[in-house]
Interface confidence: low
């Protein structure tokens, strides 16, 4: 594949990554799939600086990120280590709440209205953010 050196149209470049911010809502799995089809992944937040950047662009709206615990432990979709990595949960979160009555707990993480993170039911139709790194080998040519 080719090496991506600039961001696709309608994507925002920041610190050698490209970000795409949805304006509609999807369930977490559908959002994850959308990003993969764009040769990207749901956003992986690795620093307070990146957190502030994403927060600035999404505003006070529930928005999926690439963090889930559907198979047990919390995992970032790109393999970034969760335990040692950046975290920005709301104080009482994650709580894997079952009280919503929708079946199961809460296995997918999202940005809340104040930017801090919450775990929620993965089927909820939230906005999402895709991220792809510049200078990585892509399977497809850039979308120009």
């Amino acid at each position: 594949g080719s090496e991506r050196t600039c961001c696709p149209v309608n994507w925002v470049e920041h610190e050698r990554s490209c970000y795409w911010f949805s304006r509609s809502g999807k369930a977490w799995a559908d959002a994850d799939n959308y990003c993969r089809l764009e040769d990207a992944h749901l956003v992986v937040v690795t620093s307070w600086e990146e957190q502030k950047f994403v927060q600035h662009h999404i505003g006070p709206v529930n928005t999926w990120m690439g963090l889930h615990d559907q198979n047990g432990p919390w995992k970032w979709v790109d393999g970034t280590d969760y335990e040692t990595g950046f975290k920005n949960w709301r104080p009482e979160q994650p709580d894997d709440w079952y009280g919503h009555g929708l079946g199961g707990g809460e296995d997918c993480a999202h940005f809340t209205d104040d930017g801090r993170w919450n775990d929620d039911v993965c089927q909820r139709p939230y906005r999402w953010v895709c991220e792809t790194e510049l200078d990585k080998a892509s399977q497809e040519p850039p979308l120009l």
Epitope: P60, N62, E92, W97, Y98, G99, G101, D113
Partner: antibody, heavy 114, light 107 residues
């Protein structure tokens, strides 16, 4: 400042109806589940109903199911409780609360009596 | 439905005392428990959420512990403004339920 302000309480006859409102300010209303909790005079707290942030999911206590309807207007940042077929045992102060009780209104008194 | 019980139902204490209130759920509720304080004629106020996390702005003499079915609220050094009724509340599953309350009054 984060605030909830209830209104709409009053005296109503058994079998009558009343609609309570809860006006929210100081936070992104649509991001939070909202609940109604009531407290009969001299008694403890009783959960009544909860509605999801979008308004798409609602839950009710068995004691009010089929008689009360919770709703919200996110554009007006307002929560509602429509109470029909009121009974004497519905007499209470009704509080609206955000999320899991992190913010409460001051309450509004509903008295059901002939 | 999940039943919540509290002990004691009331207690008399003095300023400076250490006060402990227990709450028991009829089934496992993980850490999905809140403690509220209520004074006469006022709305409840959240003290502790997720069983052990202190609500913002609440003084540090309040602490919570427990998980599963057994929970404790501790006031390490009772202050004059702490005389009130305390309720536990489970939000693990609907219908949400409250404990019957514990009234803390002057000895």
């Amino acid at each position: 400042e984060v605030q909830l302000l209830e209104s709409g309480g009053g005296l109503v006859q058994p079998g009558g109806s009343l609609r309570l409102s809860c006006a929210a300010s100081g936070f992104t209303f649509s991001s939070y589940d909202m609940s109604w909790v009531r407290q009969a005079p001299g008694k403890g707290l009783e959960w009544v109903s909860t509605i999801s942030g979008s308004g798409g999911i609602t839950y009710y206590a068995d004691s009010v199911k089929g008689r009360f309807t919770i709703s919200r207007d996110n554009s007006k940042k307002t929560l509602y409780l429509q109470m029909n077929s009121l009974r004497a045992e519905d007499t209470a102060v009704y509080f609206c609360a955000r999320d899991r009780g992190s913010v409460w209104g001051q309450g509004t008194l509903v008295t059901v009596s002939s | 439905d999940i039943q919540m019980t509290q002990a004691p139902s009331s207690l008399s204490a003095s300023v400076g005392d250490r006060v402990t209130i227990t709450c028991r759920a009829s089934q496992d509720i993980s850490n999905h428990l809140v403690w509220f304080q209520q004074k006469p004629g006022k709305a409840p106020k959240s003290l502790i959420f997720a069983a052990s996390s202190l609500q913002s702005g609440v003084p540090s003499q309040f602490s919570g512990s427990g998980s599963g079915t057994d929970f404790t609220l501790t006031i390490s050094i009772l202050q004059p403004e702490d005389f009130a009724t305390y309720y536990c509340h489970q939000y693990n599953s609907y219908p949400f339920t409250f404990g019957p309350g514990t009234k803390v009054d002057f000895k």
